[in-house]
Interface confidence: medium
């Protein structure tokens, strides 16, 4: 069970990292900035 939980959270972490990498590639420094609106 613990393996399953670890795998699930690691998979989530990998997805988050992939999204961050994508955002950094598309947005550069903007990704860390305040000029962002909904």
């Amino acid at each position: 069970h613990s393996d399953g939980i670890f795998t699930d959270s690691y998979s989530r972490y990998r997805k988050q990292m992939a999204v961050k990498k994508y955002l950094a590639a598309v947005l550069g420094k903007r990704y860390k900035q305040r000029v962002k609106n909904k």
């Epitope: 955002l23 947005l27 550069g28 420094k29 903007r30 000029v35 962002k36 609106n37 909904k38």
Partner: antibody, heavy 126, light 114 residues
Framework: QSLEESGGDLVKPGASLTLTCKAS????????MCWVRQAPGKGLEWIAC????????TYYASWAKGRFTISKTSSTTVTLQMTSLTAADTATYFC????????????????????WGPGTLVTVSS | DVVMTQTPSPVSAAVGGTVTINCRAS??????LAWYQQKPGQPPKLLIS???TLESGVSSRFKGSGSGTEFILTISDLECADAATYYC????????????????FGGGTEVVVK
């Protein structure tokens, strides 16, 4: 699709002036409308931007804070109010659009301008 | 804040020739760079964004290249209509909390066509 500025004039030092930017064929929608100026024979100087979506967030160059105010007055009009004008404010004032980058539901500034108006000349002289 | 420095003006070449305009950033801006063309009495016109992406309707004679801190705008097969001042602009935003990314223009480079 075009932008057109108006309101430029010859004014005395210390005066106030409001410039207007009117869009035709472009509805302001989740982009950034900005003002950029150019003193005679000089380069480009950014003044301010406003997000045209519901937040209406405004952004100013550090030197422009307090003396310049950018506003969205309708779905196709943005204004720039200028106070305490000096000779150093003599320039052509351009209205320009930053079309924004949409990512995951957020609109980030693109930090470049794809549409410009022809400009309006402001001369400050006694 | 990022400071953009351009080739001193003017740069000149004959009709049919090639000119290169250099733009240097004071820090790494990856490929976040735009180029504008401005003719006397007219507003700037966006030519290129993201270092090399040509805007719609812009001639393929204009080519942007570079990355990091060094960028080049090359205009080939020069025409009289290319006589103008060219500005680069960092479009990476600002790492400073007290400024924004819109103000990082180069000083401009005038191109004279002989």
């Amino acid at each position: 699709q075009s932008l057109e500025e108006s309101g430029g004039d010859l004014v005395k030092p210390g005066a106030s002036l409001t410039l207007t930017c009117k869009a035709s064929g472009i509805a302001f929608s989740n982009d950034y409308m900005c003002w950029v100026r150019q003193a005679p024979g000089k380069g480009l100087e950014w003044i301010a931007c406003i997000f045209t979506g519901s937040s209406g967030s405004t952004y100013y160059a550090s030197w422009a804070k307090g003396r310049f105010t950018i506003s969205k007055t309708s779905s196709t009009t943005v204004t720039l109010q200028m106070t305490s004008l000096t000779a150093a404010d003599t320039a052509t004032y351009f209205c320009a659009r930053d079309r924004a980058i949409s990512v995951l539901g957020y609109f980030y500034a693109a930090y470049f301008f794809d549409f410009w108006g022809p400009g309006t000349l402001v001369t400050v002289s006694s | 804040d990022v400071v953009m420095t351009q080739t001193p003006s003017p740069v000149s070449a004959a009709v049919g020739g090639t000119v290169t305009i250099n733009c240097r950033a004071s820090e790494d801006i990856e490929s976040f760079l735009a180029w504008y063309q401005q003719k006397p009495g007219q507003p700037p016109k966006l030519l290129i964004s993201r270092t090399s992406t040509l805007e719609s309707g812009v001639s393929s004679r204009f080519k942007g290249s570079g990355s990091g801190t060094e960028f080049i705008l090359t205009i080939s097969d020069l025409e009289c209509a290319d006589a103008a001042t060219y500005y680069c602009q960092c479009t990476d935003g600002s790492s400073s909390s007290s400024s924004y990314g819109w103000d990082a223009f180069g000083g401009g480079t005038e191109v004279v066509v002989k």
